[in-house]
Interface confidence: medium
């Protein structure tokens, strides 16, 4: 995730780890993988020294991924002291909020919303209907709840994975003349 121009928590009274982690994967950055399932998993956040929840896509990723909070703590958290304050990190926003708008390659034209890290606001864009990334919300409200307001549990994220019906621009895609024009 990009970290420019974002609000940060202050760095105060940070102690270094007592020792190197037993498992090197504890220091790996969270990786949700390229697939698009919606699976709750836990990872060890090297910045906060805590086990945290994330949504795993269901394939690939890395070893910093645990089925339970307890397993994560057992493997990683015991090697680190509790921190009196958190290290600098982006407050509450999922990583994908900092991805650029990505219409994908397809040529359906669907109104979606994305979080613009420059303006710090959710804005409308045209989504092509396939590929793209997770900074893609069906409603302005969902975008704001997830990315502008610091997120929380990320309710409604499942909707991101649901397909949206493609609506054609009037006249259809470029350089095609339709013999008949179809609207879903």
């Amino acid at each position: 995730a990009a970290e420019e121009d974002e609000e940060f928590t202050n760095i105060t009274d940070i102690k270094p780890p007592l020792q190197k982690p037993t498992h090197s994967f504890c220091a790996m950055k969270v990786d949700d993988g390229p697939c698009r399932a919606y699976i709750k998993r836990f990872f060890f956040n090297i910045l906060t020294h805590q086990c945290e929840e994330f949504i795993y896509g269901g394939c690939e990723g890395n070893e910093n991924r645990f089925e339970s909070l307890e397993e994560c703590k057992e493997k990683c958290a015991r090697d680190y002291p509790k921190m009196t304050t958190k290290l600098t990190f982006q407050k509450g926003k999922p990583d994908f909020c900092f991805l650029e708008e990505d219409p994908g390659i397809c040529r359906g034209y669907i109104t979606r919303y994305f979080y613009n890290n420059q303006s710090k606001q959710c804005e409308r864009f045209k989504y092509g209907g396939c590929l793209g990334n997770l900074n893609n919300f069906e409603s302005l409200e969902e975008c704001k709840n997830t990315c502008e307001n610091g997120g929380g549990s990320g309710g409604g994220l499942n909707d991101i994975f649901e397909a949206q019906k493609i609506e054609w621009h009037e006249g259809g895609p470029p350089h095609h003349h339709h013999h008949h024009h179809h609207h879903h």
Epitope: P34, C35, R36, A37, G58, C59, E100, D102, P103, G104, I105, C106, R107, G108, G129, C130, L131, G132, F161, E162, A163, Q164, K165, I166, W168, G172, P173, P174, H175, H176, H180, H182, H184
Partner: antibody
Framework: EVQLVESGGGLVQPGGSLRLSCAAS????????MSWVRQAPGKGLEWVSA????????YYADSVKGRFTISRDNSKNTLYLQMNSLRAEDTAVYYC???????????WGQGTLVTVSS | QSVLTQPPSLSGAPGQRVTISCTGS?????????VQWYQQLPGTAPKLLIF???NRPSGVPDRFSGSRSGTSASLAITGLQAEDEANYYC????????????FGGGTKLTVLG
């Protein structure tokens, strides 16, 4: 008239590299996403990779992720596919195609054959 | 194995109507993603026949039509002609994979006689 002409195919040993090119004409190249689709001898079609019109977004099939890199030079109206760590199963005719309508590829090149064999 | 399932082969006599099926799942056709159809004549590149479920690009005869319902799609060819002998592929998008554009395995259509 839209034309897509692939080049760069040939025989390469397993583990080797090749760079395919696709020269485009007859349409505003930078306005269109482009894809590579391949077809193994006697087999069906398989999507390989895609790139947005600006080149800012790229996408790959799992089978080539980490080994192939798609790119484009809009000033030259040319699409590229850099293929590294080639395997026997990458042997195929590679087509470039433009994403015109919806999720469709509406114009295709004639294809270039890549053979990976020792 | 292909994500979309098509019959490997079909045949029909000239003038007949044939239908090629394409069966998907809840993560592609059933998720309301559009289906495309391509025709590949022997030794040539694929050609777009139908896009957006039932739209024909200019130049494609109206003998070709497409439809999609639920997790299935079909391509209908009426008034079958000798030059329709080719491989036909359905294609869509699958959200359960790594953002993959997916194809059916192809159907070899033979025009009898």
């Amino acid at each position: 008239e839209v034309q897509l002409v692939e080049s760069g195919g040939g025989l390469v040993q397993p583990g080797g590299s090749l760079r395919l090119s696709c020269a485009a004409s007859g349409f505003t190249f930078s306005s269109y996403a482009m894809s590579w689709v391949r077809q193994a001898p006697g087999k069906g079609l398989e999507w390989v990779s895609a790139i947005s019109g600006s080149g800012g977004s790229t996408y790959y099939a799992d089978s080539v992720k980490g080994r192939f890199t798609i790119s484009r030079d809009n000033s030259k109206n040319t699409l590229y596919l850099q293929m590294n760590s080639l395997r026997a199963e990458d042997t195929a005719v590679y087509y470039c195609a433009n994403n015109g309508a919806a999720a469709a590829w509406d114009y295709w090149g004639q294809g270039t054959l890549v053979t990976v064999s020792s | 194995q292909s994500v979309l399932t098509q019959p490997p082969s079909l045949s029909g006599a000239p003038g007949q109507r044939v239908t090629i099926s394409c069966t998907g799942s809840s993560s592609n056709l059933g998720a309301d993603y559009d289906v495309q159809w391509y025709q590949q004549l022997p030794g040539t590149a694929p050609k777009l026949l139908i896009f957006g479920n039932n739209n024909r690009p200019s130049g494609v005869p109206d003998r070709f039509s497409g439809s999609r319902s639920g997790t299935s799609a079909s391509l209908a060819i009426t008034g079958l002609q000798a030059e329709d002998e080719a491989n036909y592929y359905c294609q869509s998008y699958d959200r359960s994979l790594s953002g993959s554009m997916v194809f059916g395995g192809g159907t070899k259509l033979t025009v009898l006689g």
